[in-house]
């Protein structure tokens, strides 16, 4: 069982939120896999990185991603008192100087080389789910999450009115 807070009808603009510190509160090196235990892998092809979702062979080493966690104040149009509190945001870096980016126009997830400060497209609202899973919501596009589509990562719009469970936006983090 799992739950999504960021949904299509959610009207508050995440891009108005502010990262409360330029340095992360903590960092975590982990492998990333889907709800169905497929691994997220990164391959250097033609001087750019490609992202794949695949079953690894037995004893094949999983790629690691550095997750950097940040505190962020959630903007609150619904109430001026900040009652929505702070949320957690994350950036994901599989290799030095490269970060996962949300390409909202193409509905794609890409690896871009960039310097700090990172652009908003590199930040994702971290959702704590049941089943030991997390989900990643685009900071720049509320209600849009990193998900799995055709063995690739893609941006997927989540609609709260859909009465079905979508497991393709759930991810597992593991140190092994």
């Amino acid at each position: 069982a799992f739950g999504i807070s960021g949904v299509q009808k959610y009207t508050r603009a995440l891009h108005d939120s502010s990262i409360t510190g330029i340095s992360p509160i903590t960092e975590y090196l982990a492998s990333l896999s889907t709800y169905n235990d497929q691994s997220i892998t990164f391959a250097l092809e033609d001087e750019s990185y490609e992202i794949y979702v695949e079953d690894l062979k037995k004893d094949e080493k999983k790629d690691k991603v550095l997750l950097s966690y940040y505190e962020s104040q959630h903007p609150s149009n619904e109430s001026g008192d900040g009652v929505d509190g702070k949320m957690l945001m994350v950036t994901l870096s599989p290799t030095k100087d490269f970060w996962l980016h949300a390409n909202n126009k193409e509905h794609s997830v890409e690896l871009h080389k960039c310097e700090k400060p990172l652009p908003d497209q590199a930040f994702f609202v971290l959702h704590n789910m049941h089943s030991n899973c997390v989900s990643f919501e685009c900071k720049t596009d509320p209600g849009v999450f990193i998900g799995v589509k055709d063995n690739h990562l893609a941006l997927i719009k989540v609609d709260s009115s859909e009465n079905l469970c979508t497991e393709n936006i759930l991810f597992k983090l593991s140190e092994t």
């Epitope: 799992f2 739950g3 960021g6 959610y10 975590y28 966690y69 929505d84 509190g85 609202v125």
Partner: antibody, heavy 121, light 111 residues
Framework: EVQLVESGGGLVQPGGSLRLSCAAS????????MNWVRQAPGKGLEWMAE??????????HYAESVKGRFTISRDDSKNTVYLQMNSLRAEDTAVYYC????????????WGQGTLVTVSS | DIVMTQSPDSLAVSLGERATINCRAS??????????LNWYQQKPGQPPKLLIF???SQGSGVPDRFSGSGSGTDFTLTISSLQAEDVAVYYC?????????FGQGTKVEIK
């Protein structure tokens, strides 16, 4: 103003039933996981139940002490979460708080004022 | 279930002095590289209020004198300079696993 207002508490005999309601206002209710937490007189806090969203088929979770006796539900059209309490026991006597989890589901950050349930003959 | 144990049960501290409350979990509450440990303050006749989440991050609007630390199984809430309005019961809570469990509470009073 963001508000949660509980109602339905009162005196009930052991073995009886009661339904608590929690009316939410000031936020988009259908977007948030909701919880019930109770506090026996002069005692500490005890988490009771949680319900997620329509998107998740309203999945529910319970404390072992109330599993099979209590049922959490919600009506998004009425901005209300409920706690149906059956087979009540003296040890269920407590203030029952309705509570909302924050954006991203990391902690509870909105609480109602609570409603008192007394189970006694 | 994860059992949360706080110490001491009560604490009397002079105004302006430091107050320290400890919380121990029966097993690690770490997950995803974070500690799923929250601290709440409850004043008489009121519902609880969030102070600290993921062990050390301050809740919105929480005064800087409140800080949290720790990881794994051992955690601390510190009030650096106790004020009269800090008289309350303080609870730790783990949100790593269902059922979410609270410590028994620590009552903080003015000496």
């Amino acid at each position: 103003e963001v508000q949660l207002v509980e109602s339905g508490g009162g005196l009930v005999q052991p073995g009886g039933s009661l339904r608590l309601s929690c009316a939410a206002s000031g936020f988009t209710f259908s977007n948030y996981w909701m919880n019930w937490v109770r506090q026996a007189p002069g005692k500490g806090l005890e988490w009771m139940a949680e319900i997620t969203l329509k998107f998740n088929a309203y999945s529910t979770h319970y404390a072992e002490s109330v599993k099979g006796r209590f049922t959490i539900s919600r009506d998004d059209s009425k901005n209300t979460v409920y706690l149906q309490m059956n087979s009540l026991r003296a040890e269920d006597t407590a203030v029952y708080y309705c509570a909302r989890r924050n954006y991203g589901n990391w902690y509870i950050n909105v609480w109602g004022q609570g409603t008192l349930v007394t189970v006694s003959s | 279930d994860i059992v949360m144990t706080q110490s001491p049960d009560s604490l009397a501290v002079s105004l302006g002095e430091r107050a320290t409350i400890n919380c121990r979990a029966s097993e690690s509450v770490d997950k995803f590289g974070m500690s799923f440990l929250n601290w709440y303050q409850q004043k008489p006749g009121q519902p609880p209020k969030l102070l600290i989440f993921v062990a050390s991050s301050q809740g919105s609007g929480v005064p800087d004198r409140f800080s949290g630390s720790g990881s794994g199984t051992d955690f601390t809430l510190t009030i650096s300079s106790l004020q009269a309005e800090d008289v309350a019961v303080y609870y730790c809570q783990q949100s790593k696993d269902i059922p979410y469990t609270f410590g028994q509470g620590t009552k903080v009073e003015i000496k």
